[in-house]
């Protein structure tokens, strides 16, 4: 594709280039023949994030603590607010406009990946040497007690929910 | 004073193509977008393309894309039209027109004749 | 595409009188509408840009106001060599538009 009559940063309006208005500031007035394109910073709590033409700087995201929001990094004139989720919540999207409370792994389940700000929870079946008897955000699935390296005996053989059971192995007499 | 003088009066047959320059004169050519239109006799004006002659960016009514070809040189500040693949539809006068705040000045026009 | 309506067609006056031509665009073209005057065998001039402002040499009978959608060329009082075909134009959006024209008669 061949450029375009007006360069790069600049629009075309009324038969001529203008120059666009940087981030953080919208469009006051087109460039005439015998005048600049006129820009105005954004105001307070709003942004523009590229270099534009806008009449109207966009409003700054609100983060909103009743549905689990808080600020993440704080807008400037260029930038827009970036919500995340209070501890032990995440994102339900990735433009985050909401959230919901980490989900727990069940009994027989361990902990893959523990949940982020944007992420919830991955969990995995324990499995065959290992456990999980608690339904949990954190815990990975535990191994087995090893009974022999405390000189005792399996009793009652382990599952993906409990742990084995060790005995004092039985003396010959 | 600023003027844009076309070439004169071309007859062509339908398939053919067609160039049509437009000298400019009485400012600086690179400083102003180059604007090319049409009127086919008793009908209203259409826009074809326009062209940026500092550097030779382009844009191109839909219509005439792939057909129309806009080029400058800065060296004699000669602005072309070409126009490919003519029918007798294009039959019309076709002026060139300095930019800046609308087409602030034109050509005299010249007449292009498609027939065979 | 921006289409341009301009009325009337045509129109009859006598020198003197007060002209009016308007121009409706199909959607808001902010103001970027441009006038032009159109005689035979001779070269289309800019009378007005930009709604209002008008081009060098241009003499101050000629006027232009209007915003949005709709724009009016208004002749205070029309003088002989006024007599041609007024065109209106958008400059605001890509295709560039024209009115078809309203050619200006002596009554």
């Known amino acids: 594709e061949p450029p375009t009559a007006c360069r790069e940063k600049q629009y075309l309006i009324n038969s001529q280039c203008c120059s666009l208005c940087q981030p953080g500031q919208k469009l006051v007035s087109d460039c005439t023949e015998f005048t600049e394109t006129e820009c105005l910073p954004c105001g307070e709590s709003e942004f523009l994030d590229t270099w534009n033409r806008e009449t109207h700087c966009h409003q700054h995201k609100y983060c909103d603590p009743n549905l689990g929001l808080r600020v993440q990094q704080k807008g400037t004139s260029e930038t827009d607010t970036i919500c995340t989720c209070e501890e032990g919540w995440h994102c339900t999207s990735e433009a985050c406009e909401s959230c919901v409370l980490h989900r727990s792994c069940s009994p027989g389940f361990g902990v893959k990946q523990i949940a982020t700000g944007v992420s919830d929870t991955i969990c995995e079946p324990c499995p065959v040497g290992f456990f999980s008897n608690v339904s949990s955000a954190f815990e990975k699935c535990h191994p087995w007690t090893s009974c022999e390296t405390k000189d005792l005996v399996v009793q009652q053989a382990g599952t993906n929910k409990t742990d084995v059971v060790c005995g004092p192995q039985d003396r010959l007499r | 004073q600023v003027q844009l003088v076309q070439s004169g009066a071309e007859v062509k047959k339908p398939g053919s193509s067609v160039k049509v320059s437009c000298k400019a004169s009485?400012?600086?050519?690179?400083?102003?977008?180059i604007e090319w239109v049409r009127q086919a006799p008793g009908q209203g004006l259409e826009w074809i393309g326009v062209?940026?002659?500092?550097?030779?960016?382009?844009n191109y009514n839909e219509k005439f894309k792939g057909r129309a070809t806009l080029t400058a040189d800065k060296s004699t500040s000669t602005a072309y039209m070409e126009l490919s693949s003519l029918r007798s539809e294009d039959t019309a006068v076709y002026f060139c027109?300095?930019?800046?705040?609308?087409?602030?000045?034109w050509g005299q026009g010249t007449l292009v004749t498609v027939s065979s | 595409d921006i289409q341009m309506t301009q009325s009337p067609s045509s129109l009859s006056a006598s020198v003197g009188d007060r002209v009016t031509i308007t121009c409706r665009a199909s959607?808001?073209?902010?103001?970027?509408l441009n006038w032009y005057q159109q005689k035979p065998g001779k070269a289309v001039k800019l009378l007005i840009s930009?709604?209002?402002r008008l081009h060098s040499g241009v003499p101050s009978r000629f006027s232009g106001s209007g915003s949005g959608t709709d724009y009016t060329l208004t002749i205070s009082s029309l003088q002989p060599e006024d007599f041609a075909t007024y065109f209106c134009?958008?400059?605001?959006?890509?295709?560039?538009?024209f009115g078809q024209g309203t050619k200006v008669e002596i009554k």
């Open positions: 027109a300095r930019g800046g705040s609308g087409f602030a000045f």
């Open positions: 959607q808001d073209i902010s103001n970027h």
């Open positions: 062209i940026n002659p500092g550097y030779g960016g382009v």
């Open positions: 930009s709604t209002s």
């Open positions: 134009q958008q400059g605001n959006t890509l295709p560039w538009t």
């Open positions: 009485g400012y600086g050519f690179t400083n102003y977008l």
